[in-house]
């Protein structure tokens, strides 16, 4: 089994490993999230994503988590267990992103555009919170991201 994000295949990443890393810090992260009225990975971001779109969307979302979320949170936390879990997630996200090569074809403009719009809704919601709250919420929503990604884990 492997991830099939439309035409993009990802080998060597097992969802179970991602879940285990997340579960180790889930309670801590979600307890720190005081803003229950807002959601970053809202329905409009992840609902009815076509196979063709999925490669672009997972690419931009995971890149954001790597460059903005994990990177900034890493500088703010000192707890070894938390750092270890996020390192596992980050390393696996790097592995996934490195295997994703979304098509650059002009014909894919509308599909790529649709994925970008979904991502921008997520990013807009992230930017509306203060930095600390946004990072905490993004980390607490990794389960939403993993649940969506798991749909693309196929034979």
């Amino acid at each position: 089994q492997e991830f099939h994000f439309g035409p993009c295949q990802v080998k060597g990443v097992v969802p179970q490993k991602l879940w285990e890393a997340f579960w180790a810090v889930k309670d801590t992260m979600q307890a720190q999230d005081n803003i229950t009225s807002a959601r970053l990975l809202q329905q409009e971001v992840l609902q009815n994503v076509s196979d063709a779109e999925s490669c672009y969307l997972v690419h931009t979302l995971l890149e954001f988590y790597l460059k903005t979320v994990f990177k900034n949170y890493h500088n703010r936390t000192v707890e070894v267990r938390t750092l270890k879990s996020f390192s596992t997630l980050a390393n696996n996200f790097v592995l996934i992103v490195s295997q994703l090569q979304p098509s650059q074809e002009n014909e894919m403009f509308s599909i790529r555009d649709s994925a970008h719009r979904r991502f921008l809704l997520f990013r807009r919601a992230f930017k509306q919170l203060d930095v600390e709250a946004a990072l905490t919420k993004a980390l607490g929503e990794v389960d939403i991201l993993l649940t969506w990604m798991q749909k693309f884990y196929k034979l």
Epitope: E53, F109, S110, S114, H116, R117, L120
Partner: antibody, heavy 122, light 113 residues
Amino acid sequence: EVQLVESGGGLVQPGGSLRLSCVASGFTFDDYGMSWVRQAPGKGLEWVSFITWNGGITYYAESMKGRFTISRDNAKNTLYLQMDSLKSEDTAVYYCAKDSDPSIATPYFGSWGQGTQVTVSS
Amino acid sequence: EIVLTQSPSSVTASVGEKVTINCKSSQSVVSGSNQKSYLNWYQQRPGQSPRLLIYSASTQESGIPDRFSGSGSTTDFTLTISSVQPEDAAVYYCQQAYSAPLSFGSGTRLEIK
């Protein structure tokens, strides 16, 4: 209110270069894709180039590939078009245009600047 | 590359008349992913920048008078002005955003009698 103000146009000789700028205000610039569209004297509209919110992806019209470069500086709310190896057929009014809101499913040119005139002539 | 063919190239109408402008695409501009039509309509009055009238083939931009409507799907699209007004004298363009290079139709000039 959304405002797009282009500048940098002028008279340039064939083979020369120009850099157009478009300063945006009235909206969160880095939430939007941006385009350049041009219009030759007495002619219709012609799309030039498109850039995504972070500058990560760019598209160009075939006749401008390799000669024109679109870029943006989100810190300055500014869109650019670097035009090299200019030809007489590049003479036109150049407009910058803002993409639709991310919450809308399809892209369109929702707001336009007033345009800047580029004349390529010897 | 998607080519958009507009017809007629020009039309003259009296105030109150109905005007129809057609736009035919060389290939479908409807996305299989979201079933949306990536076809927009713009108005350009003399000496002015273009302005958006209709997007996604049939959705009216806010602030646009109700007399402007869009219809069609796949490759054939129509802009209708139900009752032409003097301020509607302009050139009208269709535009596709389905695939790059993005493209415009050649325009339809509307003159008022």
